[in-house]
């Protein structure tokens, strides 16, 4: 008999190499049975994971699995780092493995580097 526990299918040590300035969707694959759990994204800051408020998220429902998506429109250099999704289900908190975004800044040094860029030219 198939388990009806909520499961989050982010692979251990998964990573994405992405470009700043373009959109990206970070997916959290969620398996559930009857009621869809409440899912959130957070970004790791040392040992704590800071909940991402004010960020655009959406659900994509497929036949056997659903995806809770964190939208980056667009990716920013500051988005570099590790993320985790968490599900609240029947008073239980289920946390995924972390997934890491490696952001490459595509703007060359000749194209009006900002003060932030000058201070920290490379993020990946």
């Amino acid at each position: 008999k198939e388990s009806c526990d909520v499961q989050l299918y982010i692979k251990r040590q998964s990573e994405h190499r992405i470009l700043a300035g373009d959109p990206f969707e970070l997916e959290c694959p969620v398996k559930y049975c009857a009621n869809r759990p409440h899912v959130t994204w957070c970004k790791l800051n040392g040992t704590t994971c800071v909940k991402l408020e004010d960020r655009q998220t959406s659900w994509k429902e497929e036949k056997n699995i659903s995806f809770f998506i964190l939208h980056f429109e667009p990716v920013l250099p500051n988005d570099n780092g590790s993320y985790r999704c968490s599900a609240n289900f029947q008073s239980n908190l289920i946390e995924s493995h972390s997934t890491t975004l490696y952001v490459t800044d595509v703007k060359s040094a000749s194209e009006r580097p900002s003060k932030d860029e000058m201070a920290s030219r490379f993020w990946a």
Epitope: A20, G21, P74
Partner: antibody, heavy 120, light 106 residues
Framework: QVQLKESGPGLVAPSQSLSITCTVS????????VHWVRQSPGKGLEWLGV???????SYNPAPMSRLSISKDNSKSQVFLKMNSLQTDDTAMYYC??????????????WGQGTSVTVSS | QIVLSQSPAILSASPGEKVTMTCRAS?????MHWYQQKPGSSPKPWIY???NLASGVPARFSGSGSGTSYSLTISRMEAEDAATYYC?????????FGGGTKLEIK
């Protein structure tokens, strides 16, 4: 220096389609996004959509079904096509460059706009 | 969609007077941009990401706020500041603008 220039038909008949070209200089369409924003007396400023550097698009869900944005990187041109125009699509249409900093994104350089009137 | 409500719609100020206009969002946003527009011209970036002045903007302008409430302040009004100011959010698609505050000189 960075410049964006829109060219459009000026007058469009109701139910017809609108095509506007944005020609840019001073930056590459493979590095920066280009947005379309319109301004009408009734609706104020309205973001329509964006052509991202990598070639993907994002649209405002409201007029999305009537909108299409494309580009030609080699000609430094971005195109807006809008179908089934009605009188309330009468507006000034702007193309605008998008740029990111370390932790935010904004529209920085605006074209002078092209005026579109929908009338028979 | 996130609705941005600007107040007041019209503001009249004397030279040298302190001016504050506000922008309220229907949902929390990460930051707010402000644009200035004068009749017959395109909007110009004025304040980026809540508090960063765009290039060439006089230091008498400042921006502040967080969450759902943001403001633009002019420490001492000058004649050249007369214009319409729009707030703009880039947190959630569709990326919306406020209805504008028209600032007039007395």
């Amino acid at each position: 220096q960075v410049q964006l220039k829109e060219s459009g038909p000026g007058l469009v008949a109701p139910s017809q389609s609108l095509s506007i070209t944005c020609t840019v200089s001073g930056f590459s369409l493979t590095t920066y996004g280009v947005h379309w924003v319109r301004q009408s007396p009734g609706k104020g400023l309205e973001w329509l959509g964006v052509m991202w550097p990598g070639g993907r698009t994002s649209y405002n869900p409201a007029p999305m079904s009537r909108l299409s944005i494309s580009k030609d990187n080699s000609k430094s041109q971005v195109f807006l096509k809008m179908n089934s125009l009605q009188t309330d699509d009468t507006a000034m249409y702007y193309c605008v460059r998008g740029d990111y900093e370390y932790d935010y994104y904004a529209m920085d350089y605006w074209g002078q706009g092209t005026s579109v009137t929908v009338s028979s | 969609q996130i609705v941005l409500s600007q107040s007041p719609a019209i503001l009249s100020a004397s030279p040298g007077e302190k001016v504050t206009m506000t922008c309220r969002a229907s949902s929390s946003v990460s930051y707010m941009h402000w644009y200035q527009q004068k009749p017959g011209s395109s909007p110009k970036p004025w304040i980026y990401a809540t508090s960063n002045l765009a290039s060439g903007v006089p230091a008498r302008f400042s921006g502040s706020g967080s969450g759902t409430s943001y403001s633009l302040t002019i420490s001492r009004m000058e004649a050249e500041d007369a214009a319409t100011y729009y707030c703009h959010q880039w947190s959630s698609n569709p990326y919306t603008f406020g209805g504008g505050t028209k600032l007039e000189i007395k």
